[in-house]
C-alpha cells in the first residue's frame, strides 16, 4: 500500500537535484580558485541536512546555518549587483562585467539558482512530486527560506556603493514584497553602504519616459533615505545597447545615452 | 604549514578592556573563519564568536553580545578578539582556531587574561 | 543552546585497552561534530571532525562515527600519550557548544 503522501501545490524537487547540486559545486570550485579549498560533500551534506526530515512549511534561517558557514567567500563589497524581476539581464551583465556580482555568481547562489526541493517530516526522502507554494501553502518552505537567508547575507556583506537592476515594463517596477524589496534593502547596512544606485532597464523600443520618477521607485528613494544611504537612479533605455557598452565601452556609440 | 600565533599574557583591571591578536600563516587567510574560543581555569571550553576575514562576516555568542568584538586584518593576516567591561569571571585562555567543516582544525597557543584588582 | 553531554565525565584506562567516549545532543545536529585532545598547558587538538573523518596527522586508532544525536570516539588501543582530556563539540548552530570533557587516566 503507497504511504499517504502530502500533495503541495508547487512543483516538486528538480530532479537529479543531489547530483545536480554536487555537479554544480565541483564546477563552481574548479572554476574559482579561491573556493578550492571547499569540500563540495560537506556543502551537500549541509544542504541535505537543512530540509531532509524535516516538515517542508517549518523551516528555519537556522536550519541553513551549516550550509551558510560552509559555503562563505569572500565577494568584493563594492562589487554588488542586487536585481528584481530582472534576473537574466543582470546575469548577462555580470558574465561580460566580470570584476561585478549578483548572488547567482556566489558558491550558494550558483547551487540552487532555478532549482526546487523539499523534503518530507520524518523520512529521509526526496520530495520529487511536489513541493510548498509561498502563496498558496507556505512562506517557510526549504526553497523560500534558503533566498531569504543567502539574500540577506550577501545584502550585509555589500559597501560604498551597491547597484541594482529593476524591471521598467513591470507595473510594480519596484515591489516591497519581492526578496530585493523585502529583504535586501533592509539589510543594506548604512556604516558601510554609501549609496544604493537602482537601474531602470526599460522594455520598449520607443520608450522615452523617466522611470526613475515612478511612484514606486519615490517609495524605494523613501525607504533608502530613512536608512542613511543616499539613493540615485538612471533609466537604461535601450538594455542591448547598454550590454554592447558594457562590452566595447570604446565605441563611438555608447558616449550617448543608453 | 599552519600556524595560528597570538599576542602574550595580559593582566587587566576589572571594567577595561582587552585586545587579543591572532596571526595567521602557511594558508590563505581570507579562506577560512577564525574562531574564538575561552577556557577559564580547570573549565572546559566555551565559544565566544567567529570571523570571515574575507568578507567581515561575524558571529558572537549571545552571551558575549555587546562586549565582544572580532575583527580582522587581511594585511597583516591578523584577527583580534576584543573583550570589554572585564570581569574576574573572564580570567581564561583565550584561543583562536581556524575553522574547517564546522570544527576547528588548528589552534593558537593560547593567551592567558588575568583580570584583578 | 544545544547541549552536548559526554560520558563518563572521567575513567581510567591501561595501556592497550579499547576505550569510547560518547557524547549526546540536546537536538540533531546531523553530522556536524568534532572531538578534540586537551593536554594540560596546551591547546586543543582536533582529533575527527564531521563526526567521522580523521583530522591530518592523528593516528588511525582514534575512530568516530554517529549521527543526529548520539555520536561516539573510540580509541582501538590507548598509548600512553593518549592520556588527555577529550571534548566534543558541535557545529550546527550557533552559539557552538562543547560537551564538559572526559579526563582519560592512566588506571
Known amino acids: 500500500v503507497p504511504r499517504w503522501r502530502q500533495q503541495w501545490s508547487g512543483p516538486g524537487t528538480t530532479k537529479r537535484f543531489p547530483e545536480t547540486v554536487l555537479a554544480r559545486c565541483v564546477k563552481y570550485t574548479e572554476i574559482h580558485p579561491e573556493m578550492r579549498h571547499v569540500d563540495c560533500q560537506s556543502v551537500w551534506d549541509a544542504f541535505k541536512g537543512a530540509f531532509i526530515s524535516k516538515h517542508p512549511c517549518n523551516i528555519t534561517e537556522e536550519d541553513y546555518q551549516p550550509l551558510m558557514k560552509l559555503g562563505t567567500q569572500t565577494v568584493p563589497c563594492n562589487k554588488i549587483l542586487l536585481w528584481s524581476r530582472i534576473k537574466d539581464l543582470a546575469h548577462q551583465f555580470t558574465q561580460v562585467q566580470r570584476d561585478m556580482f549578483t548572488l547567482e555568481d556566489t558558491l550558494l547562489g550558483y547551487l540552487a539558482d532555478d532549482l526546487t526541493w523539499c523534503g518530507e517530516f520524518n523520512t529521509s526522502k526526496i520530495n520529487y512530486q511536489s513541493c510548498p507554494d509561498w502563496r498558496k501553502d507556505c512562506s517557510n518552505n526549504p526553497v523560500s527560506v534558503f533566498w531569504k537567508t543567502v539574500s540577506r547575507r550577501f545584502a550585509e556583506a555589500a559597501c560604498d556603493v551597491v547597484h541594482v537592476m529593476l524591471n521598467g515594463s513591470r507595473s510594480k517596477i519596484f515591489d516591497k514584497n519581492s526578496t530585493f524589496g523585502s529583504v535586501e534593502v533592509h539589510n543594506l547596512q548604512p556604516e558601510k553602504v554609501q549609496t544604493l544606485e537602482a537601474w531602470v532597464i526599460h522594455g520598449g523600443r520607443e520608450d522615452s519616459r523617466d522611470l526613475c520618477q515612478d511612484p514606486t521607485i519615490k517609495e524605494l528613494e523613501s525607504i533608502i533615505s530613512k536608512r542613511n544611504i543616499q539613493f540615485s537612479c538612471k533609466n537604461i533605455y535601450r538594455p542591448d545597447k547598454f550590454l554592447q557598452c558594457v562590452k566595447n565601452p570604446e565605441d563611438s556609440s555608447c558616449t550617448s545615452e543608453i | 604549514q599552519v600556524q595560528l600565533v597570538q599576542s602574550g599574557a595580559e593582566v587587566k583591571k576589572p571594567g577595561s578592556s582587552v585586545k587579543v591578536s591572532c596571526k595567521a600563516s602557511?594558508?590563505?587567510?581570507?579562506?577560512?573563519?577564525i574562531e574564538w574560543v575561552r577556557q577559564a581555569p580547570g573549565q572546559g571550553l566555551e565559544w565566544m564568536g567567529d570571523?570571515?576575514?574575507?568578507?567581515?562576516?561575524?558571529d558572537y555568542n549571545e552571551k558575549f553580545k555587546g562586549r565582544v568584538t572580532i575583527t580582522a586584518d587581511e594585511s597583516t593576516s591578523t584577527a583580534y578578539m576584543e573583550l570589554s567591561s572585564l570581569r574576574s569571571e573572564d580570567t581564561a585562555v583565550y584561543y583562536c582556531a581556524r575553522g574547517r567543516d564546522l570544527a576547528m582544525d588548528y589552534w593558537g597557543q593560547g593567551t592567558l587574561v588575568t583580570v584583578s584588582s | 543552546d544545544i547541549q552536548m553531554t559526554q560520558s563518563p565525565s572521567s575513567l581510567s584506562a591501561s595501556v592497550g585497552d579499547r576505550v569510547t567516549i560518547t557524547c549526546r545532543a540536546s537536538?540533531?545536529?546531523?553530522?556536524?561534530l568534532g572531538w578534540y585532545q586537551q593536554k594540560p598547558g596546551k591547546a586543543p587538538k582536533l582529533l575527527i571532525y564531521k563526526a567521522s573523518n580523521l583530522h591530518t596527522g592523528v593516528p588511525s586508532r582514534f575512530s568516530g562515527s554517529g549521527s543526529g544525536t548520539d555520536f561516539t570516539l573510540t580509541i582501538s588501543s590507548l598509548q600512553p600519550e593518549d592520556f588527555a582530556t577529550y571534548y566534543c563539540?558541535?557545529?550546527?548552530?550557533?552559539?557552538?557548544?562543547f560537551g564538559q570533557g572526559t579526563k582519560v587516566e592512566i588506571k
Open positions: 602557511g594558508y590563505t587567510f581570507t579562506n577560512h573563519w
Open positions: 563539540q558541535q557545529g550546527q548552530s550557533y552559539p557552538y557548544t
Open positions: 570571523i570571515f576575514p574575507g568578507g567581515g562576516y561575524t
Open positions: 537536538q540533531n545536529i546531523n553530522v556536524w
